[in-house]
């Protein structure tokens, strides 16, 4: 079995303020079992943007049905983008663990830049 890779095809995405940003991510394998999460930034200070397993993220919608069997697409769309949303977003795969899930692999990141709203 080939080891799972986390693919973020775009190094950067530019979006006008007020629009939605699509951040693409997919896995090359269904194994190992475990949730994915999206973060802005890396390291200890990273900000959780979306957790597949739990939580309420009103500005985030998933592009695909994540509950669908054999789904490999974990792209998200963030609505009503503001300059404060700029940064690098990482799609991270976790391996199911007990009691806590363990970070398994991260995508290379997608840098979101925000353009001024067209007048």
């Amino acid at each position: 079995e080939d080891e799972l890779q986390v693919i973020q095809p775009e190094k950067s995405v530019s979006v006008a303020a007020g629009e939605s940003a699509t951040l693409r991510c997919a896995m090359t394998s269904l194994i190992p079992v475990g949730p994915i999460m999206w973060f802005r930034g890396a390291g200890a200070g990273r900000e959780l943007i979306y957790n597949q397993k739990e939580g309420h993220f009103p500005r985030v919608t998933t592009v695909s049905e994540l509950t669908k069997r054999n789904n490999l697409d974990f792209s998200i769309s963030i609505s009503n983008i503001t300059p404060a949303d700029a940064g690098t977003y990482y799609c991270v795969k976790f391996r199911k663990g007990s009691p806590d899930d363990v970070e398994f692999k991260s995508g290379a990141g997608t840098e979101l830049s925000v353009r001024a709203k067209p007048s």
Partner: antibody, heavy 122, light 108 residues
Amino acid sequence: QVQLVESGGGVVQPGRSLRLSCAASGFTFGSFGMNWVRQAPGKGLEWVSAITASGGSTFYADSVKGRFTISRDNSKNTLYLQMNSLRAEDTAVYYCAKDFTEVVGWLGMDVWGQGTTVTVSS
Amino acid sequence: EIVMTQSPGTLSLSPGERATLSCRASQSVSSSYLAWYQQKPGQAPRLLIYGASSRATGIPDRFSGSGSGTDFTLTISRLEPEDFAVYYCQLLGSSPRTFGGGTKVEIK
């Protein structure tokens, strides 16, 4: 540069067999899913078959299932399409095409060969 | 099996005009799995748009894609002479990876 070159096309009688090859260069062939797509004269594109990067899974259009077999040799950077029991309706230009990302069939096919022509005629 | 239907079959326009091409799926699909290609006579297809709305590398920004669910659109904001070609949408993700029948954009 990234390149795909098909070969093996030709004129063949109905019921006979033909094997197409696609030689890849300029990218890590063994990391990407690959596809065969065909185009009958004056018609649109028809997806024929796909294979995962490792070769472990294959996919076929109903029109060729049971007659065509896709395979790959990652050590030779080559994709194959074995076509058996050929019919007149298989007459087409056959293109090989690379998946855009390492995720099979996710976002499209970003590199295409120039095609090889298969004519099935008695 | 999901059927992809493109319309119109032919679009007759002049250089500088806006082209709007439609692709409709017979049932709802994820936008991540919708691609658009351009094909010129005697040439292989070229990937234009992936994920319904993202331009492939090197594709001019006059090409844009939009849509979700069952209805998807490729827009060419201002036709250049080299844009007159046949355009195909494709559903990916599942098997078969169906193409639409194509829309020919021809010079009026």
